[in-house]
């Protein structure tokens, strides 16, 4: 058992069939020795008397908050909370795997620019009694300091018969120079809490393996003379770092129909402008990536052919 | 350190190629290795993070952008001189570039090329004839270290009398490469940064 | 299986013109810009230009230009490639190639060689 | 016009060992460049789209690298049915343009 926060414990549990458990004491916080009962959650029944209590807990009926009174006063509350583990493995029930990268990725995390604020989020189908937080640093045996914001609900979207929910965190290096070579990556922690099951998911990254920029601003066309080509030009996003001279981009420059089966043009370049050949009905769509460290292309930024 | 006059170049900033043939060496070696030492740990979440020139050379201080030089957390040890030097630049560029970051530069490819000779010695003994370095890419390093040209004392290569460790050996490969690859893309920052100045 | 056929070898004497053609199977003919590449005997390719068969846009490289015409027939997912005003230098042999993506070609036709002699 | 420039031209090369095309343009671009296998009386076939890219159905011996000027395509083990000759095609901007290919033959 461990403390998750004041008055809050976890019951870390092996989680098969006819498990003993973990027998648990329970101490009233208090100066007074006698005349003290106990009781779980809105029950009136008493589990017990004494300035401490002990309970065998197996399972989700022995959670809850447990609340030592005198005379009718409540002095205090332990609320316990059940982490399960099975076959060796920690539950991962509350969050929705999200497959990408890879398999048993429960947290993606995502950098516009360097400058060491990030964004990470998760998924689950869990609508309420669910509350997360969330830590993080640079390193973990002489942890570096990262401030994380609260995590908030980001979207909700219906998958099928299910309603998936998005919850989103920003947190920022405190002291983050973005030309630095990382050597250490950086940790965030999510504790997860529905109803009385808690969950722990983390997620070690490099910023420099995060970066995925904004889409390049302010595209523009300019047709050329006696030519089906056209130059786009467009400008680099204003989140990235600079100067840009040394936080470089690179750009894929694509012309396609609305369908992605039709035929399309392509072109790389190094530069904010590219002669491409726009077709009726098609788009023009540009985007970014860094130009050294291949991470994550950007969204596209759009305009019509036409 | 004999530090060469700067000589006046036509065109683009030379070592800006150079530059970018060396970020495409090392990636492709990192790939190769990564490919062929699937079954070590080689990966950037499997190896531990070690800097070769950690407390000997002073790249990314020396060379920070002027616009980051107000970023108090980038300015941790910074002993900026602005002074320019090398053959790299042309002579109306130098005010905007420091002896000390090309020639930190230069000794970062010094050291990783003595490591990279001598890890490919043992290479070349191991029985399973399993990975060695990419010569192009020992030649693209010995190519900017040419165009950088600052004389400096020559680092003997390390010998080791004891019977290598080819498991430790390709270990430590992978660790050179990372590190390296991440010095590689500092490097064609600061180039790229040069060359628009 | 995607597949480019093209007619057979011609001898043209200098000044005169050739039509080649090129008949796609497999696939949507439209759905692919389809171009012609020639190659003299002994040297790499030349691109000559393409067209979009969908709506007949054409784009020639400015070396074949006025000499060169692109056709294409949705009916018959037929290409045709003609080339005028030919000079012994115009020995080659003619590929169409096609592909999805407008600037490289994934699928060739085998070849037709143009033999211009007097 | 981007000029295109291979080079060895011609490339002797021992089965089994590993074999490296270079392909040199004469201004950036990018990654606007592509590979093709041409054997005697065939067509091309292309092996590497945007100097990198694998294509479906070609050996994985088969690689490329490069950006801005300098590509190189390389196959790690020279098989019987690898000798023949190589193109690079630059698709930056029109005219596309080729290099003079590079014959790979058995040494």
């Known amino acids: 058992i461990w403390e998750l926060k004041k008055d809050v414990y976890v019951v870390e549990l092996d989680w098969y069939p006819d498990a003993p458990g973990e027998m648990v004491v329970l101490t009233c916080d208090t100066p007074e020795e006698d005349g003290i009962t106990w009781t779980l959650d809105q029950s009136s029944e008493v589990l017990g008397s004494g300035k401490t209590l002990t309970i065998q807990v197996k399972e989700f009926g022995d959670a809850g908050q447990y609340t030592c009174h005198k005379g009718g006063e409540v002095l205090s509350h332990s609320l316990l909370l059940l982490h399960k583990k099975e076959d060796g493995i920690w539950s991962t029930d509350i969050l929705k795997d999200q497959k990408e990268p890879k398999n048993k990725t429960f947290l993606r995390c995502e950098a516009k620019n360097y400058s060491g604020r990030f964004t990470c989020w998760w998924l689950t189908t869990i609508s309420t009694d669910l509350t997360f937080s969330v830590k993080s640093s640079r390193g973990s045996s002489d942890p570096q300091g990262v401030t994380c914001g609260a995590a908030t609900l980001s979207a909700e979207r219906v998958r099928g018969d299910n309603k998936e929910y998005e919850y989103s965190v920003e947190c920022q290096e405190d002291s983050a120079c973005p030309a630095a070579e990382e050597s250490l990556p950086i940790e965030v922690m999510v504790d997860a809490v529905h109803k009385l099951k808690y969950e722990n998911y983390t997620s070690s990254f490099f910023i420099r393996d995060i970066i995925k920029p904004d889409p390049p601003k302010n595209l523009q066309l300019k047709p050329l003379k006696n030519s089906r080509q056209v130059e786009v030009s467009w400008e680099y996003p204003d989140t990235w770092s600079t100067p840009h001279s040394y936080f470089s981009l690179t750009f894929c420059v694509q012309v396609q129909g609305k369908s992605k089966r039709e035929k399309k043009d392509r072109v790389f370049t190094d530069k904010t402008s590219a002669t491409v050949i726009c077709r009726k009905n098609a788009s023009i769509s540009v985007r970014a990536q860094d130009r050294y460290y291949s991470s994550s292309w950007s969204e596209w930024a759009s305009v019509p052919c036409s | 350190r004999n530090l060469p006059v700067a000589t006046p170049d036509p065109g683009m900033f030379p070592c800006l190629h150079h530059s970018q043939n060396l970020l495409r060496a090392v990636s492709n070696m990192l790939q190769k290795a990564r490919q062929t030492l699937e079954f070590y740990p080689c990966t950037s979440e499997e190896i531990d993070h070690e800097d070769i020139t950690k407390d000997k050379t002073s790249t990314v201080e020396a060379c920070l952008p002027l616009e980051l030089t107000k970023n108090e957390s980038c300015l941790n040890s910074r002993e900026t001189s602005f002074i320019t030097n090398g053959s790299c630049l042309a002579s109306r560029k130098t005010s905007f570039m420091m002896a000390l970051c090309l020639s930190s530069i230069y000794e970062d490819l010094k050291m990783y090329q003595v490591e990279f000779k001598t890890m490919n010695a043992k290479l070349l003994m191991d029985p399973k004839r399993q990975i060695f370095l990419d010569q192009n890419m020992l030649a693209v390093i010995d190519e900017l270290m040419q165009a950088l040209n600052f004389n400096s004392e020559t680092v003997p290569q390390k010998s080791s009398l004891e019977e290598p460790d080819f498991y430790k050996t390709k270990i430590k490969l992978c660790i050179l490469l990372h590190a390296f690859r991440i010095r590689a893309v500092t490097i064609d920052r600061v180039m790229s940064y040069l060359n628009a100045s | 299986q995607v597949q480019l056929v093209q007619s057979g070898a011609e001898v043209k004497k200098p000044g005169s013109s050739v039509k080649v053609s090129c008949k796609a199977s497999g696939g949507t003919f439209s759905d692919y810009y389809l171009h012609w590449v020639r190659q003299a005997p002994g040297q790499g390719q030349e691109w000559m230009g393409w067209?979009?068969?969908?709506?007949?846009?054409?784009e020639y490289a400015p070396k074949f230009q006025g000499r060169v015409t692109i056709t294409a027939d949705e009916s018959t997912s037929t290409a045709y490639m003609e080339l005028s005003s030919l000079r012994s230098e115009d020995t080659a042999v003619y590929y169409c190639?096609?592909?999805?993506?407008?600037?490289?070609?994934?699928?060739w036709g085998q070849g037709t060689l143009v033999t211009v002699s007097s | 016009d981007i000029v295109m420039t291979q080079s060895p031209l011609s490339l002797p090369v021992t089965p089994g060992e590993p074999a490296s095309i270079s392909c040199r343009a004469s201004q950036s671009i990018s990654i606007n460049l592509h590979w093709y296998q041409q054997k005697p009386g065939q067509q091309p076939r292309l092996l590497i789209a945007f100097a990198s890219q694998s294509i479906s159905g070609v050996p994985s011996r088969f690689s490329g690298s490069g950006s801005g000027t300098d590509f190189t395509l390389t196959i790690s083990s020279l098989q019987p049915e690898d000798f023949a000759t190589y193109y690079c095609q630059q698709s930056n901007s029109f005219p596309l343009t080729f290099g003079q290919g590079t014959k790979v033959e058995i040494k």
């Open positions: 190639a096609r592909n999805k993506e407008l600037r490289y070609f994934d699928v």
């Open positions: 067209i979009d068969p969908e709506n007949g846009d054409t």
